[in-house]
Structure formats: structure tokens, C-alpha cells
């Protein structure tokens, strides 16, 4: 598979936001790239979000997506928002070179995202 690199561990912010870079080694000059974030937990894999972008253009996720991102060359900066402690898990970056043919696929080893729910503020009189 195509080589895809991502950090091993990321700690989400207190606001439930986690960011990481997904970098891939392209065999050639792809013009259309698809990036998918998958979450693996208890051997179940679910799609978190996905975006297709043209090289040189911005990465655009669906409006209701919990992901945002920017791209620069063979690097994609991914941000996942609205995370809670129950969302802690392994987040895998999948990269597909869609055009021109041939099709190339790469799967990262995953980024373990730890999410800690903030302690509620004590009531003050």
C-alpha cells in the first residue's frame, strides 16, 4: 500500500478538539485525492468523515461533518471537533489517489486520540 504517516498519539483539547497531520507518499502526480478518517474501537471500524479534493485546492468536508482540514502538497492537516471521552479511540487516516488512474490506496497506522471530558465548574455563590 501507499505509505501514510500519522502521529501515534494526540490528546484532545479541553474543548473536545483534536488535530493531527496525515502525510502520504504519492507514487506520481495525482490530481484528485480522497481522505477518509476511520475510527477503530473494539475491532469495529466506522467512518468519521471523508473529503475529496483537487490538488492545489482546499479540502472540503460536508457542512455537517465534525471534521475540518487543510491540504498542502502531500500533507493533510485534519481537525476533529465535538469529541467526548466516549470518542477516545484509534483514528485511522485513509488516503486514496482517485485520478488520474491508476488507483492507489494507503492506510495509516492510526492516531490514538484521548479525550477527557472537562470537570464541571463548581457553582459559585
Amino acid at each position: 500500500a501507499m505509505h501514510v504517516a500519522q502521529p501515534a498519539v494526540v490528546l484532545a483539547s479541553s474543548r473536545g478538539i483534536a488535530s493531527f497531520v496525515c502525510e502520504y507518499a504519492s507514487p506520481g502526480k495525482a490530481t484528485e485525492v480522497r481522505v477518509t478518517v476511520l475510527r477503530q474501537a473494539d475491532s469495529q471500524v466506522t467512518e468519521v468523515c471523508a473529503a475529496t479534493y483537487m490538488m492545489g485546492n482546499e479540502l472540503t468536508f460536508l457542512d455537517d461533518s465534525i471534521c475540518t482540514g487543510t491540504s498542502s502538497g502531500n500533507q493533510v492537516n485534519l481537525t476533529i471537533q465535538g469529541l467526548r471521552a466516549m470518542d477516545t479511540g484509534l483514528y485511522i487516516c485513509k488516503v486514496e489517489l482517485m485520478y488520474p488512474p491508476p488507483y492507489y490506496l494507503g492506510i495509516g497506522n492510526g492516531t490514538q486520540i484521548y479525550v477527557i471530558d472537562p470537570e464541571p465548574c463548581p457553582d459559585s455563590d
Partner: antibody, heavy 115, light 107 residues
């Protein structure tokens, strides 16, 4: 127009050697990983070998059935990929295809291993 | 190594029928699956790449679906020219194993 043209097939005795060539045109050869796939008579498709390109340091991969006997190589200056086949067995008989990462395929060349 | 289990090995259907061929993998291949058509005496032709994407020049009668370990090739309305053998293939990682093939015939 994309073209992959295999050559070098023929009749060879068991234990013998043969070298297949595949000439590519119509696409950027150096940007692609190249593969050899075969189909034995009455059997299905079998992937044999892959050679990656310069960004991947020309890494090579082989199926268990040919590892140690077959060698894949490429010459980007000639837009060509090769398959050196040694210690041939009768079960290596079949049509051999070269393919640019499975999107583009050649017409195939027949290799017959028989005494 | 990733094992590919393709079924059925052969099938006969009528023109206009909806036809489905399935491929199951021994582990999650994350959608890294291609489908090919091979007619006698011809080279294999890529139909579907990445489990769901239609290759250039392929009729929209063909579609692919699935994820994880279970994948399907569907022909929405069988035509006489679809008589061929169909193969799935793992393209996630080496060895890039093919399924055993499904020979499709017209009733």
C-alpha cells in the same frame, strides 16, 4: 492511448529460464507501480510480482509461488518492465500480463513450460 | 496473507436480470478491492476500483459496494455482452490476491 505490449514468451523446458518484457506508452511510466499477473490454462488470475517506482526506492514484492525464482525489474528510461523467470516448472505455463497498478493491462504473452 | 473468498463460482441468469457477485476477505481491507471482467482471449478489464468507484469507460450497469470484509459487484440489468468471468482482488497490500472467479452465463 495507453499501451502495454508484452514480449518474450515461448516454449521453454522445465528447469529453464526466460525473460519477459513489457513496453509501455501513453502514460507517465515512471509515476506508476508495475505488476505481472498470469493466468494458467483453466485457472484464475494470479498476481506474481510488483515493482514500485523511484519515490518508493523501486521496492519489489513477490507471490510465494514465484519468490526466489522470478525477478521483476524496470528501466524508466525505456518505459519498460521485465520479468526474469528461472527454474521454470510445468505449472508456470500460462498467459503472462503486465499491468500498470491494475488499471492498464497488456494483451499478454504465452509461456509454455514443457519437455 | 489476505484470503479472498468469491461466490458463486458460476451463475446463469437471464437478460435483464439483476446479478450480484460477492467477495469476502479474511481481514479488513478498508475498501481496497477491485473488480475485473475477463472475456475469453481478452485481457482483464478493470470495472470497479476502491470497492465502489466505476472505472473510466465502464457501463453504469456495473456497481460496487461493501466495506470491511464484505464486498459486492452488481450488474443492474444483465446484457449478452456481460458474459465473462469476474474477479475481485485485494489491492490493499501484497500479496495482491485475486478471488477464484465467477463465470457468468446467459440462460
Amino acid at each position: 492511448e495507453v499501451q502495454l505490449v508484452e514480449s518474450g514468451g515461448g516454449l521453454v523446458q522445465p528447469g529453464g529460464s526466460i525473460r519477459l518484457s513489457c513496453a509501455a506508452s501513453g502514460f507517465t511510466f515512471s509515476d506508476n507501480w508495475m505488476n505481472w499477473v498470469r493466468q494458467a490454462p483453466g485457472k484464475g488470475l494470479e498476481w506474481l510480482a510488483q515493482i514500485r517506482n523511484k519515490p518508493y526506492n523501486y521496492e519489489t514484492y513477490y507471490s510465494a509461488s514465484v519468490k526466489g525464482r522470478f525477478t521483476i525489474s524496470r528501466d524508466d528510461s525505456k518505459n519498460s518492465v521485465y520479468l526474469q523467470m528461472n527454474s521454470l516448472k510445468t505449472e508456470d505455463t500460462g498467459v503472462y500480463y503486465c499491468t500498470a497498478q491494475f488499471a492498464y493491462w497488456g494483451q499478454g504473452t504465452l509461456v509454455t513450460v514443457s519437455s | 496473507d489476505i484470503q479472498m473468498t468469491q461466490s458463486p463460482s458460476s451463475l446463469s441468469a437471464s437478460v435483464g436480470d439483476r446479478v450480484t457477485i460477492t467477495c469476502r476477505t479474511s481481514e479488513n481491507i478498508y475498501g481496497g478491492l477491485n473488480w475485473y471482467q475477463r472475456k475469453p482471449g481478452k485481457s482483464p478489464k478493470l470495472l470497479i476500483y476502491g470497492a465502489t468507484n466505476l472505472a473510466s469507460g465502464v457501463s453504469s450497469r456495473f456497481s460496487g459496494s461493501g466495506s470491511g470484509t464484505d464486498y459486492t459487484l452488481t450488474i443492474s440489468s444483465l446484457q449478452p455482452e456481460d458474459v465473462a468471468t469476474y474477479y475481485c482482488q485485494n489491492v490493499l497490500r501484497s500479496p495482491f490476491t485475486f478471488g477464484s472467479g465467477t463465470k457468468l452465463e446467459i440462460k
